[in-house]
């Protein structure tokens, strides 16, 4: 029962985590214009992995995709790759874990096979979570570096008279979503790995031994089954699973376009 709960919870946590990783990857607010200690602008700039956006004071928002592949910074490409690898591994892990769930019976799948699948999905979730955390952290590090570089030469003089204000960027909402989602996926993966230990059949498997007593025979079988009497009873042993109540995933609500300006 505890194993089923651990496995089920691990699956749900990983599912939420992977949904979060997908959401973070798609979000535009990986970096947002730093409004602190800056001239008050009538525009708000923010950037994602795939496009950059500008929201004007009227509320009009204009986004432009990064239509070049070679012209993009290597770090951005690396972050994209990490997030996509995380999503792919997570998706495969989810697929594998569905079949590995103890509460789902598929044919005559052995517990050992389920244990292996649970371990596989657990490892996939762990790697997926690590990819997401790494991707977000690399981007965050890139932002911090650029932030201090632009602070150092915030006002770059042009001809001594004219000044160009450099737009500084700080952490966007997607980074926090990514970190949390990566963490959840990682935790879910660990829970799956823990559940795998409980699912794995013990090394010493005792064969069923029949004890012949006078008048009737009773076959004792290991593994928690009730003993079945041998006199003409054709009753098959059935495992009764406590499926448990499964909570629905909460609907992911994306940030609405707030009236920032």
């Amino acid at each position: 029962m505890a194993v089923t709960a651990c496995q089920g919870l691990g699956f749900v946590v990983s599912l939420i985590g992977i949904a979060g990783i997908i959401a973070a990857t798609c979000m535009d607010q990986w970096s947002t214009q730093d409004l602190y200690n800056n001239p008050v602008t009538a525009v708000f700039n923010y950037q994602g992995l795939w496009r950059s956006c500008v929201r004007e004071s009227s509320g009009f928002t204009e986004c432009r995709g990064y239509f070049t592949l070679l012209g993009l910074p290597a770090m951005l490409q690396a972050v994209r790759a990490l997030m996509i690898v995380g999503i792919v591994l997570g998706a495969i892990g989810l697929l594998v874990s569905i079949f590995a769930l103890k509460c789902i019976r598929i044919g005559s799948m052995e517990d050992s096979a389920k244990a292996n699948m649970t371990l596989t999905s657990g490892i996939m979730f762990i790697v997926s979570g690590l990819c997401a955390i790494a991707g977000v952290s690399v981007f965050a590090n890139m932002l911090v570096t650029n932030f201090w570089m632009s602070t150092a030469n915030m006002y770059t003089g042009m001809g001594g008279m004219v000044q160009t204000v450099q737009t500084r960027y700080t952490f966007g909402a997607a980074l926090f979503v990514g970190w949390v989602a990566g963490g959840l996926t990682l935790i879910g993966g660990v829970m799956m790995c823990i559940a795998c230990r409980g699912l794995a059949p013990e090394e010493t498997n005792y064969k069923a031994v029949s004890y012949h007593a006078s008048g009737h025979s009773v076959a004792y079988k290991p593994g928690g089954f009730k003993a079945s009497t041998g006199f003409g009873s054709n009753t098959k042993n059935k495992k009764i699973y406590d499926g448990g109540a499964r909570t629905e995933d909460e609907v992911q609500s994306y940030p609405s376009k707030h009236d920032y300006v």
Epitope: P39, T41, A42, V43, N45, V54, S57, S58
Partner: antibody
């Protein structure tokens, strides 16, 4: 047809107060940010204040900060400018102007203006 | 605050001739996020409110004749009237639309020579 009509101007003594109104029609008022801009006699244009469509963002020119208050009532399609502690240099024609939606923050429609005279 | 400086203060041009008004800002009005310039040009005829001519440094507002054109980027901008008409006599203002407080140039008075 987009229309902005200012009212509430008049003669006021220094230190006095005045409340300007701007009635909007011909467009969905709650979808647009609105500005107040003034023009002193024979002088150029001076931006005064801005209020966003949902009133969440308000900006003022340094010359009026702390003395003027911009507000709006989307239900009444109206914009207001409460002017307190008026000075002689506040004498001007006051225009309300709509911040265009996709005009790079430029003001695409202007009212005819209302005259405020601060004099003793 | 951003200082907008227009030149010349006044300009007299013959009908049908080209009129050019310059505007210089103390800081770049080019937004790095979308590489767009946030500068507008307004026309104000005597006794009338200003009218938007150009926004985004080079985009004509609706209903504006194509003889009006805007150019420039960063800190230097130009309004050009390719063939001056009698109804173009007015004061022209440039405006910073990127930084609050929004600031206007001092204006350029355009007259017919």
């Amino acid at each position: 047809e987009v229309q902005l009509v200012e009212s509430g101007g008049g003669l006021v003594q220094p230190g006095g107060s005045l409340r300007l109104s701007c009635a909007a029609s011909g467009f969905t008022f709650s979808d647009y940010g609105i500005h107040w801009v003034r023009q002193a006699p024979g002088k150029g244009l001076e931006w005064v204040a801005y209020i966003s469509r949902g009133s969440s963002t308000i900006y003022y020119a340094d010359t009026v900060k702390g003395r003027f208050t911009i507000s709006r009532d989307n239900a009444k399609n109206s914009l207001y400018l409460q002017m307190n502690s008026l000075r002689a240099e506040d004498t001007a024609v006051y225009y309300c102007a709509r911040g265009g939606y996709d005009t790079r923050n430029a003001m695409d429609y202007w009212g005819q203006g209302t005259t405020v005279t601060v004099s003793s | 605050d951003i200082v907008m400086t227009q030149s010349p203060d006044s300009l007299a041009v013959s009908l049908g001739e080209r009129a050019t008004i310059n505007c210089k800002s103390s800081q770049s009005l080019l937004n790095s996020g979308n590489q767009k310039n946030y500068l507008a040009w307004y026309q104000q005829k005597p006794g009338q409110p200003p009218k938007l001519l150009i926004y985004g440094a080079s985009t004509r507002a609706s209903g504006v004749p194509d003889r009006f054109s805007g150019s420039g980027s960063g800190t230097d901008f130009t309004l050009t009237i390719s063939s001056l008409q009698a109804e173009d006599v007015a004061v022209y203002y440039c405006q910073n639309d990127l930084y609050y407080p929004l600031t206007f140039g001092q204006g350029t008075k355009l007259e017919i020579k």
